[in-house]
Structures are given as C-alpha cells and as structure tokens.
C-alpha cells in the first residue's frame, strides 16, 4: 500500500463570527492504525481542538461518523466561531500505542473570522469652542477582523480631510480596533452641523457604519450686544432696551448696571430659536430722568455659558430742565459693537474666546 | 490507557438470560465499535455481534441474532451483551473487544467473562 | 458467508526457525484496494492479541519477526525465527464482511 498522506485541501478558511467553520481533512490510507487529532499552532504549546480517541469538545463535530468502516475523512466542524478561533489548525495522524504516535500532519489550515466592528462612537471635545477656532472629534470601533478597514469622516454630508486614523494592534490579532480623529474649523452657522464617522469592512456587505456627533455640542456662538434708548416718555421716563443676538447655548445671564450699581439681573430661558439655531434676547430697564441730577451711565452686562462678562454702556444726558415736559433730553451710545465686546472701560473685562 | 473491564463470572441454569458488562476507559467511548467474542473451552473464536456506541446500530452474527441483544450505556460508558435461553453449549468465555481502527477487528480487548450454563 | 480455514490445525517448529500459518477464504477479501485480513495471537488463558491487521501490516509494539502476507483468498503469517514465548493459537479473521475467525493454528516448540 502507498504512504500514508495526510491532506488538508484548503490553505486557509474565512468564517464569519457566529457561524461555523468546516476544516476539511482526509487521509489517503486506512493504514497505520490510529487516531486523528486536531491542533491549533504548532510545536509544545499546540492547542488541542479535537481527538478522535478522547476528550470532550462540545463545539467540534466530526462531519463523517468516526466509527464508519473505511473511514478516511477527518473533517471536523466547529460551531459557533468568534475572533478567537483564529489561528492555523492541523489535521495530525497518530499510530496506535502505548501511547499513540505522531505520525504525520497536514499542512494546515489557516482559519481567519470575519468580525464586525462595533459601532462607530464619535466623541468630541470636553469644552466648547467659537467659530474659527479647530476642535477635534474622535471617532473609534473595536472587534472587526480581518484588519483592513476604512474610515471617512464627513461635516454635512461633505466629505473631510484633516484627520489621523489608527488600527491597532499592528501585529497579527484575533479583532482589531479602529480610532481616527478629525480636526473640524468651527463656523457660527455650525449650530445645526453634524459630523458622521463612516466605517467599511468587508463583513458590512457595502453597508457601512455610521456614528455621528452634534457640533451643537461642542459649539459657542458668542452674542452681539447692541444698546438703545427709545424717545422719552411723557412720565420723564427713558426706556433702553440691551438686544443680545445669535448666541449659542441658551445659557445666559444679564445684568443691567446703573452708574456701576446692580440695578436687575435676569437669566434667559424658553427663547424661541432662530434658523441657525442660535437665540436673541432683548432686555428693556426705564430710568426716570428726572430722579437724575448728573448724566446716568447704563450698562448691560452679559456672562454667557460661563465666560467672563461682556459690556455694553450707554448714557442718558439729563438736561438742564430736566422735569420740564419735552425738554431735549440726549442720550449717547458710547459703547462699541465690535465682536471682540470690549467694554467701554476695557480695563475690567476681556473677553476670551 | 485503553482498559476494557468485564463483570465477574457467571452461573446460569439452563433457559436462563445472563448479562455481562464491559467497562470502557482511556478513550472516547461513542467513537469506536465494541465487538462481542466467545470461546468455549478448548475451542476457537467466535464473533457475536458488534455495536456501535454513538447510535446502537448493531450487526449480529445469524447464529445469535435471535438470542443475543447488545447495548451501551455512553453516561457510564459501558457496553453490555444479553444472552437468552441459554443451553449448555452456551458455556463459554465472553469477551468484549474495541476495533480502534473501524476496521471491524479487534484491537483491545477485556480479560473475558465466564458464563457456565449447567442445571 | 466467507469461511476461513487455516492450515494446519497445529504446528511444531524448533526454536530458531521460521513458522508458517496459512489462512484461506472461501471468496476474495479483498475491497477498496485492502485485503481485510488480521491476525491474532492468544496464548493461554488470556485474551487474544492483535498481531496483524489488513493482511501485512504489523499492530503497534509486534516484534518485527511477525509478518503477514497474501491477496485475495490466500494469506501467510510468517514468524521469521520462533522464540519461546511465540508458543500460542493463532487465529485469522476477515472482515469483508461481517466478521469470522478461522478455526486457529496452535503452534509448538519441536
């Protein structure tokens, strides 16, 4: 009779997680006599997977009944695959003893699972930023295999560039894990902006993942502040109103000072919303001008989302005659609305971005 | 190690049963056939039956098929032969073998069981 | 049914010298290209032992002076140079089929 030949047909087998995994086997001689074993690896630290003699392998089946007379296909089937069982397995020969002997292997089978990752989770910056300024979003799914893997990062629905993409571990893996991050240019029209991690593996089918974060999250949008006074009333009173416009979160406390004192503090809430997702605000205070002797210096005092405060002065000139009805009292805007929101005095507040 | 370990000797009065056990250890029980052999005194060998464990097919030899009954029990891994009706020429060592190699032969075998049958 | 008759029914061979056993089969035992032929040794008072299997291929831990030959019908078990402790029944056994044995050779020292 010819030499006994171990085979094992196929170089490498790709299962999906969850399935089943077929590693054919089958031997070209019904002599020597002896078992067959299956192993993972090679050498001392070999794995044993399943022994026709004995031993307990509740996930391994052999395909053909083992005591089938002339039997000479060793196929075993493994259920219920994970990442883990990655690896190469060898169909091994032994001779009947005392014990058995090793007598020959296949050349092996290498078994790789195909994993899916794991949905994509966008995280993005621990504190908000303003417009113009960079954040960063990161972006990462775990558990795939094989390695190859891609990875698009989008602001709505147009495609971005300026990112870092990582796949780890370098090294041959049972899964691997994907973590990428994008550098995005904040605008003050990102109220409303998304931005969408996109992940393609093979095991997807051309279905990608998609994790997404709200730039909402990680936007400020700082408020214009404008300071205005109506025409004077007939009771000697003047109405200033203080428009606080497109400022992002609704967080926001006013402050109305008169002559550097605390007049009212107001904290905004339930504002309506403007397209762009940002919020307006106006404050109103009535000073009676004739309780004033000297020019009454008004100021609106803005702490949005925790900043430091934003100022905007005005003064109301008392006239000479200032009870007489109708008399020409002035008002004078001598605040700046500039975005930086300097305050008149600009040596108590600055504004930082 | 495979150890195949019979039950002790039997006495039976003609027309009796008898029921002799064979314990396996040192392999996968349900994946090699136990066979069944006699030999009387001073006589050759004579095949029984055979059974597979994992399923209970069996295979009889006509001589038997109608007295002998085989069956296992895989929780305890053993292997049992029944014999009805026994008559004197029933008189015999009963042996139980494993075929390691599906083979159908005799690869390990116990130390036997003696079954006399006289009134 | 196979019957399988072995010649002679005993032998006596002096120590040293070859012992021949025949076994022949009512009809060919040869399929899927084996000849499914083994031999047995039993020595007394205990079980037999696997000596042979698929006509010529010697079982695990059998000294090497046993060896088995033949095709078809007609099969040879041949001890190369008899010791003392080869003194035994041997028997012949077919598995074409449902199983037989022979009906054993007993061999002897001279």
């Known amino acids: 009779e010819e030499e006994l030949q171990v085979i094992q047909p196929e170089k490498s087998v790709s299962v999906a997680a969850g399935e089943s995994a077929t590693l054919n086997c089958t031997a070209t001689s019904l002599i020597p006599v002896g078992p067959i074993q299956w192993f993972r690896g090679v050498g001392p630290g070999r794995e044993l997977i399943y022994s026709q003699k004995e031993g307990h392998f509740p996930r391994v089946t052999p395909v053909s009944d083992p005591t089938k007379r002339n039997n000479m296909d060793f196929s075993i089937r493994i259920s219920n695959i994970t990442p883990a069982d990655a690896g190469t397995y060898y169909c091994v020969k032994f001779r009947k003893g005392s014990p058995d002997v090793e007598l020959k292997s296949g050349a092996g089978t290498e078994l790789s699972v195909r994993a899916k990752p794991s949905a994509p989770v966008v995280s993005g910056p621990a504190v908000r930023a303003t417009a113009e300024h960079t954040v960063s979003f990161t972006c990462e799914s775990h558990g795939f295999s094989p390695r190859d893997i891609t990875l698009k990062w989008f602001k709505n629905g147009n495609e971005l560039s300026d990112f870092q993409t990582n796949v780890d571990p370098a090294g041959k893996s049972v899964s691997y894990s994907i973590r990428s991050t994008a550098r995005v240019v904040l605008t003050r029209r990102d109220v409303h902006s998304q931005v969408i991690c996109e992940v393609a593996h093979v095991t997807l089918q051309g279905d990608p993942l998609r994790g997404t974060a709200n730039l909402s999250e990680a936007i400020r949008v700082p408020p214009f502040l404008e300071v205005t006074q109506q025409s004077m009333r007939a009771d000697n009173q003047v109405n200033v109103t203080c428009q606080v416009t497109k400022f992002y979160p609704q967080r926001l406390q006013l402050t109305w000072l008169e002559n550097g004192n605390v007049s009212r503090t107001e904290m905004a809430s339930a504002l309506p919303e403007n397209k762009d997702g940002t919020y307006n605000w106006t404050s109103w205070l009535l000073v009676n001008v004739s309780a004033h002797r000297d020019d009454v210096k008004l100021t609106c005092q803005v702490e949005h989302d925790g900043q430091p405060a934003v100022n905007k002065s005005f003064s109301v000139k008392v006239s000479a005659h200032p009870k007489e009805q109708g008399s020409n009292t002035a008002a004078e805007n001598t605040g700046t609305n500039e975005r930086d929101y300097k305050d008149d005095d600009d040596k108590h507040h600055h504004h930082h971005h | 190690q495979v150890q195949l370990v019979q039950s002790g000797a039997e006495v039976k009065k003609p027309g009796a049963s008898v029921k002799v056990s064979c314990k396996a250890s040192?392999?996968?029980?349900?994946?090699?056939?136990i066979n069944w052999v006699r030999q009387a005194p001073g006589q050759g060998l004579e095949w029984i039956a055979m059974?597979?464990?994992?399923?209970?097919?069996?295979h009889y030899n006509q001589i038997f098929k109608d007295r002998a009954t085989l069956t296992t029990d895989t929780s305890t891994s053993t292997a049992y032969m029944e014999l009805r009706s026994l008559r004197s020429d029933d008189t015999a060592v009963y042996y139980c073998?494993?075929?390691?190699?599906?083979?159908?032969?005799?690869?390990?075998w116990g130390r036997g069981t003696l079954v006399t049958v006289s009134s | 049914d196979i019957v399988l008759t072995q010649s002679p029914d005993s032998l006596a061979v002096s120590l040293g010298e070859r012992a021949t056993i025949n076994c022949r089969a009512s009809?060919?035992?040869?399929?899927?290209?084996?000849?499914?032929i083994f031999w047995y040794q039993q020595k007394p008072g205990q079980p037999p032992k696997l000596l042979i299997y698929?006509?010529?291929n010697r079982d695990s831990g059998v000294p090497d002076r046993f060896s088995g030959s033949g095709s078809g019908t007609d099969f040879t078990l041949t001890i190369s140079s008899l010791q003392a402790e080869d003194v035994a029944v041997y028997y012949c056994q077919h598995s074409r089929e449902l199983p037989t044995f022979g009906q054993g050779t007993k061999l002897e020292i001279k």
């Open positions: 073998a494993m075929d390691y190699g599906s083979l159908y032969a005799m690869d390990y």
């Open positions: 009809q060919s035992v040869r399929s899927s290209g084996y000849n499914w």
């Open positions: 059974i597979d464990p994992s399923d209970s097919e069996t």
């Open positions: 040192g392999y996968t029980f349900t994946n090699y056939w």
């Open positions: 698929l006509a010529s």
